[in-house]
């Protein structure tokens, strides 16, 4: 499977040549270039950057580089009518207003077109009412409020802290609880690491910093007005009332200084336990409403943002494969940012740029990959993964027949502690083998492999001597490729120490303070972590595009399927009586997993032994590997989520960022004890077990000998 066996290349054009061409200094230079002004989706600045990247990729040597444009629904604040939140007194006078913008960082005071903090796709509205503090606004937080504390959020404005789950899930939960508005804020407990200074003196969030972000619940739909189909020139668009995933209540984000002014006045119930308290000097009372002296005061939201159909631009670069040009390995990451994008996305875009440059250098020397490599700079990721999803919708027939793998390339860093990888089990062995060949950039691991430092710092919870690799969830551009189309996918970045830093994401995420200086001064001054991520992402693409036999190991899928089956069975077994009453059995699923395991084992044996010089047999075996991920797709999709079609993995219904295994069964079992019709609920559990068992069995059969 060595890359230098690939056709039409001299021995020096191997993986080593590709990796040696990657330079930290270039990544640094590209990052600087991409972060000097905002590149908000739908703006002229982001169009200009798309054209610059197109031009540079052509110079780097790609065969073709095209812009693919779509007209999608985006959301912007009203420039003359700013969004804010007030405390009003009994006469309706505004006695306190939240900030209209973040104090700009040093050196950026005169930059124009910094979009003020807002929740993208919030409807307009000016609701007023009593405040209820709902912790992280997770499903379990609303259970605690409504079931245990008997607090009714109906007609209230809720205030929730960012973190733990995707903000869109928070808004959905608040809507279902009957709230008439949502205030989101960053609590220092989640966005301020102890012992670190606030920006610009450190990488912590200052009190005036605010996290922007979309609050959609698209469930993989892409453009809210054209679900399932590309938002092209002749698209039929839904009316706004029928648009997918839009929130129905006003939502607005604030920083912790403004949040303190709201939270310090809260009365009503005390927090149920310490997990509801953040780090501000406020009581974290739940409410509803303000305490004694302030009980006549209310909170009022003023939201005037507008939804507008706007043109976006993907950049699609092609490096044609020499042997299998009809097999595509895709490296994609987004280009649009909320403001400067110092980390998200440009730390990723700079890495992609350097990977393209390295591949281009090899191509100019006469080399070509075995398979075609597609490079993508996606637009409007921040507005709901729109650019990648529209392109995949437009090209779905090609992708489902030709797509070998998708490697995602958003932020290269969210910390500088160790590697973090989320991928399909098919890529586990690829990632392990690659990281064993790469040098660790970590202090104290000089001369050691990346695999070694990664395993030491982030050990697998199941397998001794191996690193943790996580399930793919969503919240990034791999979603359509993996969850909808069933193309093997993976992502890698450098991360923080999750054990010592319990804040969510990185503190300056989606704020104006996410600048080039943040990265250069505090996260990666030598750009050695960026270089390592470039080597991992680039190395994966190189191997996937160049290995004679695809570097997928189907036995690793067998292992995780058994683990997931055990997990979902143990969840179901929390209800032994009902399982008996309704004759719920997991036998079919365990049997299918057993069959999959045996067939995968036999396939792997054949893979070692077959004649690799026979192009027909080689292509046949590779196609079985390529189409295995596809075999886990159910064309009907998951219940109420038609664009999440992968039966083994889906984004959690309670947190888009997290992956859930056997999601159909999981959701059917969730909170089943509270269902009004237990017979119907357990019937759905049985149906989901049936779908999962069938799908695993059907996938196994794609690995059987063809005749």
């Amino acid at each position: 499977k060595s890359s230098n066996e690939a056709t039409n290349i001299t021995p020096k054009h191997n993986m080593k040549a590709f990796l040696d061409e990657l330079k930290a200094e270039n990544i640094k230079k590209f990052l600087y270039n991409f972060t000097q002004i905002p590149h908000l989706a739908g703006t002229e600045q982001n169009f200009q950057l798309a054209k610059q990247i197109q031009s540079q990729w052509k110079e780097f040597g790609l065969d073709s580089v095209e812009l693919a444009h779509y007209d999608v629904l985006l959301s912007y604040p009203n420039k003359t009518h700013p969004n804010y939140i007030s405390i009003i007194n009994e006469d309706g006078n505004e006695i306190f207003n939240t900030s209209l913008f973040e104090p700009p960082p040093p050196g950026y005071e005169n930059v124009s077109d910094i979009v003020p903090p807002f929740s993208a796709f919030s409807p307009q509205g000016m609701p007023e009412g009593d405040l209820v503090y709902v912790n992280y606004a997770r499903t379990e937080d609303f259970f605690k409020l409504e079931r245990d504390m008997k607090i009714n959020c109906s007609g209230k404005i809720v205030i929730a802290r960012y973190g733990k789950v995707f903000r869109g899930n928070k808004v959905k939960n608040a809507q279902l609880a009957g709230a008439k508005g949502v205030i989101l804020y960053s609590d220092p407990a989640d966005y301020f690491a102890p012992g670190v200074k606030s920006y610009p003196d450190g990488w912590n969030l200052p009190g005036g910093g605010v996290q922007r972000g979309n609050i959609l619940n698209l469930n993989g739909a892409g453009d809210p007005l054209t679900p399932g189909y590309p938002a092209n020139e002749y698209a039929y668009r839904r009316g706004i009332a029928e648009a997918v995933g839009l929130p129905s209540i006003p939502v607005h984000p604030i920083g912790y200084y403004d949040a303190q002014k709201l939270l310090e006045k809260m009365g009503g119930s005390a927090p149920p336990d310490s997990s509801w308290r953040g780090s501000l000097k406020v009581p974290y009372n739940v409410g509803p409403g303000f305490t004694g002296n302030f009980s006549t005061q209310k909170v009022k939201m003023h939201i005037h943002s507008t939804n507008e159909v706007t043109r976006i631009y993907n950049v699609i670069g092609t490096l044609r494969g020499a042997v299998e040009p009809d097999r595509y390995v895709i490296l994609g990451g987004h280009r649009d940012s909320w403001v400067f994008g110092g980390i998200d996305p440009q730390s990723g875009a700079a890495v992609v740029h350097e990977i393209v440059r390295s591949f281009g250098t090899l191509k100019k020397e006469g080399w070509r990959p075995r398979r075609t490599i597609l490079f993508a700079s996606w637009d409007a990721e921040e507005f709901g993964l729109l650019g990648s999803t529209e392109w995949a919708e437009e090209n779905s027939r090609l992708l489902q027949e030709r797509g070998v793998a998708y490697i995602n390339a958003d932020s290269s860093i969210e910390g500088n502690y160790t590697l973090r990888v989320d991928c399909t089990p098919l890529m586990y062995s690829l990632v392990h083998n690659l990281t064993k060949e790469l040098k660790s950039p970590d202090e104290g691991f000089e001369g050691k492999s990346l695999y070694e430092s990664w395993t030491k710092k982030s050990p697998s919870p199941e397998f001794s001597g191996m690193p943790r690799i996580s399930k793919l969830g969503s919240g990034n551009d791999f979603e359509v490729f993996f969850q909808r189309l069933g193309i093997a996918s993976g992502r890698a970045r450098y991360t923080k120490n999750w054990e010592t830093n319990k804040f969510s994401g990185y503190p300056l995420y989606h704020s104006v303070y996410e600048t080039y200086e943040l990265v250069e001064k505090f996260y990666d001054p030598m750009f050695k972590y960026h270089l390592t991520v470039a080597q991992v992402r680039g190395g994966m693409v190189f191997e996937l595009a160049n290995s004679i036999v695809l570097p997928f190991d189907c036995r690793d899928y067998a292992v995780v399927l058994r683990k997931y089956a055990d997990k979902i069975y143990s969840i179901s077994m929390k209800h032994p009586q009902e399982m008996k009453t309704y004759s719920v059995s997991f036998d079919s699923l365990f049997s299918a997993v057993k069959n999959f395991t045996e067939i995968a084992s036999k396939f792997s044996e054949r893979l070692q032994d077959f004649d690799k010089s026979n192009p027909i047999v080689l292509r046949m075996m590779n196609d079985q590997l390529m189409f295995l991920e596809r075999a886990f797709i159910d064309p009907l999709g998951l219940p109420d989520r038609p664009f999440y079609r992968h039966v083994i993995y889906a984004p959690s219904s309670h947190n888009k960022y997290a992956g859930e295994s056997f999601p159909g069964i999981y959701d059917a079992l969730f909170d089943i004890e509270s269902k009004v019709d237990p017979s119907k609920a357990w019937g759905e559990v049985k149906r989901q077990i049936y779908v999962a068992a069938f799908t695993v069995q059907a996938a196994a059969e794609t690995l059987s000998e063809v005749a």
Epitope: I87, I95, F96, N97, S99, P103, P188, F192, P194, G207, G208, Y256, Y257, Q260, K261, S274, R277, G278, S279, L280, K281, V282, P283, Y284
Partner: antibody
């Protein structure tokens, strides 16, 4: 961060006096401004604080009738009026910013205004 | 109001010695969020007070690491390892968990 206070003020007993504290170098509306009194050779005594964003005021019980705090956002200035001063009010009066999270302590102090109440 | 009692009132030291100042509170200073808002200030002769330590043990920016704070609940200590001439002045403890109050002060002076 700078907090500018006049060096001294001479006041007649009973004639109220307004002390000023002009802030610069930070986002004025985010931070409580405190007033602290120090009589000659004595310790520090907290008078009260005001939040520039909404003029919310919190006063020590002892100074409820003695001090009135106000703010002018346009000039980033906080004022403290001493009502019906007596010789007992002769002291240095400091304005000091409450550092908010993570400090919740008085992180920056003015130079103090020395008030002398004398006929 | 919370009463903060500092000891000693006066602390004569030789340069290079360690100094230790105690601050005792009339009630617990732990806030409901688990933090304790007990701070230490130094007022050098003829100057305004300056923040040294916040929330019991955190040095404010620019404060040398010879200053350290410790304690919990109602008992707190400020230690100065190897006193230097510029450390002389009056040290005040203060709390902001409840309505803010200050201790009476401890004068650090040369023996």
């Amino acid at each position: 961060v700078q907090l500018q206070q006049p060096g001294a003020a001479l006041v007649r007993p009973g004639a109220s006096v307004r002390l000023s504290c002009k802030a610069s170098g930070y986002s004025f509306t985010y931070y409580w401004m405190n007033w602290v009194m120090q009589r000659p050779g004595q310790g520090l005594e907290w008078i009260g604080m005001i939040h520039p964003s909404d003029s919310e005021t919190r006063l020590s019980q002892k100074f409820r009738d003695k001090a009135t705090l106000t703010v002018d956002k346009s000039s980033s200035t906080v004022y403290m009026q001493l009502n019906s001063p007596t010789s007992d009010d002769s002291a240095v009066y400091y304005c000091a910013r409450d550092g908010n999270f993570p400090y919740y302590a008085l992180d920056y102090w003015g130079q103090g205004t020395s008030v002398t109440v004398s006929s | 109001d919370v009463v903060l009692t500092q000891a000693p009132l006066s602390l004569p030291v030789s340069l290079g010695d360690q100094a230790s100042i105690s601050c005792r509170s009339s009630q617990s200073l732990e806030y409901s969020n688990g933090n304790t808002y007990l701070h230490w200030y130094l007022q050098k002769p003829g100057q305004s007070p300056e923040l040294l330590i916040y929330t019991v043990s955190n040095r404010f920016s620019g404060v040398p690491d010879r200053f350290s704070g410790s304690g919990s609940g109602t008992d707190f200590t400020l230690k100065i390892h190897r006193v230097e001439a510029e450390d002389l002045g009056v040290y005040f403890c203060s709390q902001s968990t409840h309505v803010p109050t200050f201790g009476g002060g401890t004068k650090l002076e040369i023996k």
